[in-house]
Interface confidence: low
């Protein structure tokens, strides 16, 4: 028997520095977690203690904090090289700055293979990207070899900016021939490493003949055997065992997100490459694990540029940006409109001639807007200003909801109106009229939404049975502020870009902004 230790991360999203327990900015260092310096300590400790170790990343290193905003992926290549990752799969967010923003900072600089079998390049891009990412890689580990095949969510064109010269194929269809080739090469230990979410990970384990282990990402799935060490609730045991169609037991793993945990899986193979046993658990990277001093020093050196950046002007406002709770928790506020407009702008993807865009709607809890911005400071808007407005380090995500769920969400928005509560929704691509004289749960009297399958966008009444795409904060997608119906009834959820980054990019693009209060949210009384 031969034993392999797989260490794995996924959806790190730019958390190079240690974070608080909820993966936001570290405030009290003694209670902070994760970060590459602490990760390196644990990885090195395991490498010294065990003979056959692979360190793998299942994608979405890009996007999530000011580190990515400033360094644009160079930080990912630098620190992943320093940690000596063995392989990485491409995630959807690796395309956030277009293909160029992937090629130059990461693909050309990484000293480890970057993988995806289901992304095929065409046209002029094909030669430019040639050999920079691979469908699979065979890695020598001790005196054996292990094949790693990569995969990426085929929804990437809707979630990021891969352009028109990359084709995202069905994961299973693309993986099978690559695994077949590895088998022909006498590679009998094969790991599928990829970024399509837990449901697809399980399907790959079930359907792709020859895959021994699946290491996934995208859905931020937390798996754990026994009592979990922090706040995350396990979606199942670690590893999650899938019985393949050909009768094998295939372990599937994921390690939550944000570098909070290091996935740790031990696999025992027989001489024919069959998995005999698999066990492990994610390791919580808490303050009991010291930060490696050399990596920490390097982090501090890279940090200097970030502090300078946060005070630079992004753009100007010529109007007061009303982000006060007195406005945003009671009525339409222009800060809410600005943020929603930025959210939609960030999701412009012309992937189908029938649609002007794939999504037109935005909702945003008023309680998530934490500060106004005064235009009387020469109109200057900085990252620092935006960090006061959006201090929670969230993301603006894409969900699919039925009209009936949206209607419930808007009823919840005003179910206890007048108490300055955070659930009052700011909107984009939506016209809502409330009648507060009616009883809670029956106060939405008009709800019109902007069409997407149209050449001239116009507002049409919400249809209860239709499925709509909506951009919203991850806080709402996870049922925050009492929006349990969104969490329970959403049909799809893809995590998006860092909230501040979305707004800062929009302001930089527009240069001068002047958002108005324009009748997106109205109140009426009486008969309708």
């Amino acid at each position: 028997a031969w034993e392999l230790t797989i260490l794995h991360t996924n959806d790190v999203h730019s958390r190079l520095e240690q974070t608080s327990e909820d993966s936001s900015k570290c405030v009290n260092a003694s209670r902070c977690m994760g970060g590459v310096a602490r990760l390196f300590t644990k990885v090195q400790q395991i490498r010294r203690a065990e003979p056959n170790v692979l360190l793998l990343d299942a994608g979405d290193q890009y996007q999530g904090t000011i580190w990515f905003t400033v360094y644009k992926g160079a930080e990912v290549a630098h620190f992943m090289n320093a940690l000596r990752y063995d392989a990485m799969a491409l995630g959807n967010h690796e395309f956030d700055n277009g293909v160029e923003g992937l090629i130059e900072p990461l693909l050309k600089e990484a000293k480890f293979p970057i993988l995806s079998a289901n992304i095929k390049a065409k046209g002029p891009l094909a030669s430019q990207i040639s050999g920079l990412y691979l469908p699979y890689k065979v890695l020598p580990v001790g005196d054996e070899v292990v094949g790693i095949v990569g995969y990426t969510s085929k929804e990437t064109p809707f979630l990021s900016n891969p352009g028109t010269n990359l084709v995202f194929e069905d994961e299973i269809t693309a993986l099978q021939p690559e695994v077949d080739k590895l088998k022909t090469l006498n590679v009998n230990k094969i790991i599928a490493l990829g970024h399509s979410g837990f449901e697809m990970d399980k399907l790959i384990a079930q359907k792709v003949r020859g895959v021994d282990v699946v290491v996934g990402g995208h859905s931020n799935t937390f798996l754990y055997t026994g009592n979990p060490p922090s706040k995350e609730v396990p979606a199942g045991k670690y590893p999650f065992i899938v019985t393949s169609d050909d009768g094998r037991k295939v372990p599937v793993v994921q390690a939550y997100a944000f570098g909070k945990y290091l996935g740790y899986l031990k696999i025992e193979f027989d001489e024919r490459g069959n998995v005999i046993s698999s066990h492990g658990n994610p390791i919580l990277l808490n303050s009991s694990i010291p930060e490696d001093p050399s990596i920490k020093a390097d982090i501090n050196k890279w940090r200097i540029k970030l502090d300078n950046y946060s005070t630079q002007e992004l753009g100007k406002t010529i109007v007061y940006l009303d982000g006060s709770s007195q406005s945003c928790r009671f009525r339409e506020c222009n800060m809410g409109n600005l943020i929603c407009d930025a959210m939609i702008n960030n999701n412009l993807r012309h992937t189908d001639e029938m649609f002007w865009n794939h999504v037109s709607m935005c909702i945003l809890n008023g309680g998530g807007i934490r500060s106004p911005i005064d235009e009387r400071n020469n109109g200057t808007i900085t990252w620092e200003n935006l960090a006061a407005v959006l201090p929670f380090g969230g993301t603006f995500d894409l969900v699919q909801l039925k009209g009936s769920t949206l209607k419930k969400a808007f009823e919840h928005s005003v179910h206890r109106y007048g108490q300055s509560t955070g659930e009052f929704l700011q909107v984009g691509g939506i016209h809502v009229v409330y009648d507060l004289s009616r009883k809670p749960g029956d106060r939405v009297v008009k709800l019109d939404v902007l069409c997407t399958k149209c050449r001239v966008p116009s507002y049409d009444p919400l249809k209860m049975d239709e499925v709509y795409k909506v951009i919203l904060p991850n806080f709402l997608a996870n049922g925050g502020d009492g929006f349990q119906m969104i969490k329970d009834e959403l049909l799809r959820h893809d995590s998006g870009d860092q909230d501040i980054n979305v707004v800062s990019t929009y302001i930089s693009k527009m240069k001068v902004i002047y958002p108005a209060v324009e009748g997106r949210i109205k109140f009426s009384t009486g008969s309708h």
């Epitope: 095929k120 020598p140 080739k181 090469l185």
Partner: antibody, heavy 121, light 111 residues
Framework: QVQLVQSGAEVKKSGSSVKVSCKAS????????ISWVRQAPGQGLEWMGM????????NYAQKFQGRVTITADESTSIAYMELSSLRSEDTAVYYC??????????????WGQGTMVTVSS | QAVLTQPSSVSGAPGQRVTISCTGT?????????IHWYQQLPGTAPKLLMY???RRPSGVPDRFSGSKSGTSASLTITGLQVEDEADYYC???????????FGGGTKLTVL
């Protein structure tokens, strides 16, 4: 960039064996996939088999199974192809070819200059 | 008999566009295995021209392009030049044969 240099031309009698060598330089030989491809005069290309030195074992095309042996010596960075029970239709140019690094692509990026093997009766 | 089928010859005048087809089956191209193309000038070893359907190794001009549809692939040369006169081969992996297979080759003549 790896280079492949093959041994010289051979004239062999029908029923005998031939062993052609392919020396790699300028890279990590053990992790390359080395294939052998032959081309009879005026004919197309035919894949015979491949070896990845780090794996040790070779793979062979069904047509040549039992008649061809592909080996590799990591210490000298040389791959060998031995074909036995030669017949006149084995007269061909024999090429070694590599993908340049295992699993980068299964295309043959680097080729040797070819070794002419003539089988006479 | 080659597993992948190519026309035995094609021709074109300088500056023209020519396409060489490569037809396979559900056990090679149709199964999703990559197609690679080689150029062989008279008396020399083959040279990789295009891999994974449409990627060019460095040094290959962008006049050469590749595509795939179903169980077939094709190599297109635009702006034909005299030095393009050569034999062209397609190659893929075949799951039935558990090995790499070539087309029979296409002789391109530049008129």
């Amino acid at each position: 960039q790896v280079q492949l240099v093959q041994s010289g031309a051979e004239v062999k009698k029908s029923g005998s064996s031939v062993k052609v060598s392919c020396k790699a330089s300028g890279g990590t030989f053990s992790s390359y996939a080395i294939s052998w491809v032959r081309q009879a005069p005026g004919q197309g290309l035919e894949w015979m088999g491949m070896i990845i030195p780090i794996f040790g074992t070779a793979n062979y095309a069904q047509k040549f199974q039992g008649r061809v042996t592909i080996t590799a010596d990591e210490s000298t960075s040389i791959a060998y192809m031995e074909l036995s029970s030669l017949r006149s239709e084995d007269t061909a140019v024999y090429y070694c070819a590599s993908d340049g690094a295992v699993a980068a692509y299964d295309a043959f990026l680097i080729w040797g200059q070819g070794t002419m093997v003539t089988v006479s009766s | 008999q080659a597993v992948l089928t190519q026309p035995s010859s094609v021709s074109g005048a300088p500056g023209q566009r020519v396409t060489i087809s490569c037809t396979g089956t559900s056990s090679n191209i149709g199964a999703g295995f990559d197609i690679h193309w080689y150029q062989q000038l008279p008396g020399t070893a083959p040279k990789l021209l295009m891999y994974r359907f449409s990627r060019r190794p460095s040094g290959v001009p962008d006049r050469f392009s590749g595509s795939k549809s179903g169980t077939s692939a094709s190599l297109t040369i635009t702006g034909l030049q005299v030095e393009d006169e050569a034999d062209y081969y397609c190659q893929s992996y075949d799951s039935g044969q558990r090995g790499w297979v070539f087309g029979g080759g296409t002789k391109l003549t530049v008129l």
